[in-house]
Interface confidence: medium
Amino acid sequence: SSPTSSASSFSSSAPFLASAVSAQPPLPDQCPALCECSEAARTVKCVNRNLTEVPTDLPAYVRNLFLTGNQLAVLPAGAFARRPPLAELAALNLSGSRLDEVRAGAFEHLPSLRQLDLSHNPLADLSPFAFSGSNASVSAPSPLVELILNHIVPPEDERQNRSFEGMVVAALRSGLALRGLTRLELASNHFLFLPRDLLAQLPSLRYLDLRNNSLVSLTYASFRNLTHLESLHLEDNALKVLHNSTLAEWHGLAHVKVFLDNNPWVCDCYMADMVAWLKETEVVPDKARLTCAFPEKMRNRGLLDLNSSDLDCDAVLPQSLQTS
């Protein structure tokens, strides 16, 4: 049997079908069906329209594209590739569009894409090459500066026994394409751990949001290379204690602020170094709000109010907290 044809005038890691775009370039003021357009604001909104595909006839002037609240299911390679290319597209919001699959090269041929929001999509399959577009060991840098991936974890029964963290990290580190990324949001993804090699591939990060995950420990994560990091959000996780290695790394980052509220801190003898560090540091703006969750006798005590004599290790922890 024979393959489909793949005529192309783009250089790309994947064939690009001429017929996948509008046969004629759209008129400058044309607005796709089911969308609202403002040429003055360079904005196209195709919101809550149950679209199953990206409109082919997007106006060339589009700088801000909202495709939220749709039913896209799959983003194939070259989903936004057009003739002429959408050269101005800088902000793309695909949140809440029931995407469960983003394929290699989905965002190719968007030379100005700075901000991408894929939040609130159950991404069961995020290709390792979704953002890099190629499987080269070092690929061309992506123009992306902000990547918003909040609540992209699929329901538990749809996770196919694969490491969701691993899948996301593979896409983020592929070919070092995201080395220009300054903002990364990964909130509400049920992350149990922070993979060791995630942060090493993102040297330009200024803002990292990991709030509302299930992080129990940061022992294996290294923040050393994040010399530009300004905000690290770790609120609403399952952190029990922070160890000296992590605290020392944060201390070495010139501008960082770390947010730690609403974690179930275990106030035993292992907490002594962290408490001492908190009392001295300016790195944690919400430090006065941090309270003990365990053991029972320490519950709701402020971490800044503790003395070393308060921190002993003879209390028995709940079983659920002994696993890390």
Epitope: T4, T52, T56, A73, V74, P76, A77, G78, D125, R162
Partner: antibody, heavy 122, light 110 residues
Framework: EVMLVESGGGLVKPGGSLKLSCAAS????????MSWVRQTPEKRLEWVAY????????YYLDSVKGRFTISRDNAKNTLYLQMSSLRSEDTALFYC???????????????WGQGTTLTVSS | EIVLTQSPALMAASPGEKVTITCSVS???????LHWYQQKSGASPKPWIY???NLASGVPVRFSGSGSGTSFSLTISSMEAEDAATYYC???????????FGAGTKLELK
Amino acid sequence: EVMLVESGGGLVKPGGSLKLSCAASGFTFSDYAMSWVRQTPEKRLEWVAYISSGGGNTYYLDSVKGRFTISRDNAKNTLYLQMSSLRSEDTALFYCAREESYNYYRHFFDYWGQGTTLTVSS
Amino acid sequence: EIVLTQSPALMAASPGEKVTITCSVSSSISSSSLHWYQQKSGASPKPWIYGTSNLASGVPVRFSGSGSGTSFSLTISSMEAEDAATYYCQQWSSYPPILTFGAGTKLELK
């Protein structure tokens, strides 16, 4: 040259189980979504199951949900279909099919295997 | 669930004759989701037309596809002996995720 070669078909009693395999060659298997499609004795084509390139996403025909499981081993370039609680109406020629990955016309099958026959009969 | 109805189920055409096979969809779908395959006796299906109107590689230009919404068709401008085969239309719908085929149209040479 792209090749898809199915195997594992045979005669099974109702309620029995069987695992089909599809060996892929001539292309980067891990780049492509794959499906199983069956052809009934009446020559009707019926899509059975789909799996995305990385294996994270699967879809099934309603009548096989809970009985069939599609999976893949990208290291071995092989697609599988584990079938259990088989019924006489599952009797068919089973094809594995590759989905064209690099265009917007999704779920279009650009290569098909030669098929393997499943017969469910007592 | 979307149902594809092909008509006619069986037809015969003479060499040189124009042939049209239709595929009616029970509810409106995107044109990019409608595809056609050709199958000859004893062989596997072959990709024929994708996204309503795009010919797969190697398909003769006498074939064309058209349609939108709920009505799609495959046309042969001038029937040739090698075109005798069964043609199936196929569509994909995102929610619920399901892929369906028409029952097929068997085209014979008169």
